[in-house]
Amino acid sequence: QLSRAGRSAPLAAGCPDRCEPARCPPQPEHCEGGRARDACGCCEVCGAPEGAACGLQEGPCGEGLQCVVPFGVPASATVRRRAQAGLCVCASSEPVCGSDANTYANLCQLRAASRRSERLHRPPVIVLQRGACGQGQEDPNSLRHKYNFIADVVEKIAPAVVHIELFRKLPFSKREVPVASGSGFIVSEDGLIVTNAHVVTNKHRVKVELKNGATYEAKIKDVDEKADIALIKIDHQGKLPVLLLGRSSELRPGEFVVAIGSPFSLQNTVTTGIVSTTQRGGKELGLRNSDMDYIQTDAIINYGNSGGPLVNLDGEVIGINTLKVTAGISFAIPSDKIKKFLTESHDRQAKGKAITKKKYIGIRMMSLTSSKAKELKDRHRDFPDVISGAYIIEVIPDTPAEAGGLKENDVIISINGQSVVSANDVSDVIKRESTLNMVVRRGNEDIMITVIPEEIDP
């Protein structure tokens, strides 16, 4: 039995005390204006469509429509009792975008189109978004409009972030297959792109894909393997969007940063965080270029955005996303280093500069502070009981450090009789000494290790 809860009050004249569905007249299969309840709220009837007359004689308006008298007053039971006719008007007045990619003046028109579609045994039209198709619902006063500064940065820089893919040849068939991919960013309108050296190598064909899907063969112009920076070039007609390099030396701990990359065609991956340490005594990471500083951030850097830019909120590049060390700690090559590389690369290509040798042992390390030691101790139960020294994050294969027996998670506490408080101490000794007699804390043992640095090109 139908309830009368849906009826207008006071009750329309002539309504039964109790609704009896059996007394409801049969209804056509399709109603142009959609279904509605009769004046008594008992029977489902065909509602009048938008723009049709409504009121006591004409019957109710269809779903989502309301009966409005010429003065714009919704037709109540009182109006109907005066037998004053109104017009069916859509309760919603804003445009909507339908799943058929058409923009409808209001929700009611979309519903009418959906009913017509179903009558023709086609899929119903559903609402995809408020507002016209292809147009965002931008309310300049909305919170998301005001406060999505990260999205604003991404929108600004994304066109200059590229997807890089490397191809190799199969040995006999010589067919090319993809072997690796990474990201990069455009630094000159004529097609110079900066990426990580580990993303590209001379043995491979390098393909670059722009945000718009255009693909180009790239030539490797210059590589600094130790700093892990590479410069590649595409030939493009017209001007390309570029990213400007900011001053990494002016970065402050706590600044918002955005790491962006293009791990797949036509898609960007975005992570965000803050600067944890501005110029992490880069020597500390023990990367081959011992006099280089790194930016430490908690923005996640992974294979997807490796080689892509780390930017500040002005959209300036303040680093190249380069490596993830452990959960929550990632590093980027500072933009000041990129500037230096680009300047030197320009000089090298102009006059072929001589390069001085550097000493290298092959570890990535960081200074151990009491807070860092506590954090590591919480993470690894067998972490040594030390609060200072140089903590080894990684031992690079086929290096003097590996040959000497250094291992990941070791803490260097002294070299050649001098105590080691920070990773800088290790870097300084490497520069000066040809043999390093180290005391290393491993678990809760002290181990003697000898490492002989090798000379390499910077």
Partner: antibody, heavy 123, light 105 residues
Framework: QVQLVQSGAEVKKPGASVKVSCKAS????????MHWVRQAPGQRLEWMGA????????AYNQKFKGRVTITADKSASTAYMELSSLRSEDTAVYYC????????????????WGQGTLVTVSS | DIQMTQSPSSLSASVGDRVTITCSVS?????MYWYQQKPGKAPKLLIY???NLASGVPSRFSGSGSGTDFTFTISSLQPEDIATYYC????????FGQGTKLEIK
Amino acid sequence: QVQLVQSGAEVKKPGASVKVSCKASGYTFTDYEMHWVRQAPGQRLEWMGAIDPETGGTAYNQKFKGRVTITADKSASTAYMELSSLRSEDTAVYYCTREGYSYEGGGYYFDYWGQGTLVTVSS
Amino acid sequence: DIQMTQSPSSLSASVGDRVTITCSVSSSVSYMYWYQQKPGKAPKLLIYDTSNLASGVPSRFSGSGSGTDFTFTISSLQPEDIATYYCQQWYSYPTFGQGTKLEIK
């Protein structure tokens, strides 16, 4: 993980043919060439030939040219090696092995191997 | 065709010994590869691109050399290292050395 699973041991008469299969899993079958290497008792490993599963292109060791046919079925991720006109000196363990590739140096080697199929040729 | 000469063809050593195997080729090659094969098993890659350790291989194994002369070394022999070792080059097509059978004294 990458796995290459070969068909079982075979005993053949001289003059006959043998067809050994190798089912690959754990990687994109068409991104690597599949090679066949054999090892006669007490002998060194001997490369027989290879196939690019995507195109069906093959390369053979001249020593076996005309007697060996390598094929691949992309849809089944399976490679086959057929050796005809068998003689007693073809008694060996036959291995399928995937061509590996060094990203750093650009060199080629064999990184994954099947368990081997013993083919005995005896009258 | 490139000729490969691996030596010695067999050797006996004690646990903890340093073991060296050499491989010479008739023409200069870019890289050498080294495999270990245990009885009844398929070969297993140990060293690629002359000196790089394959994934999961203990650091006591190493490789060196260039051009026509290459060396494979086990710094401290372990009982589980008993096997036959093969060098392999890939010039116009892959060829293997005749193998070195390693036994424990």
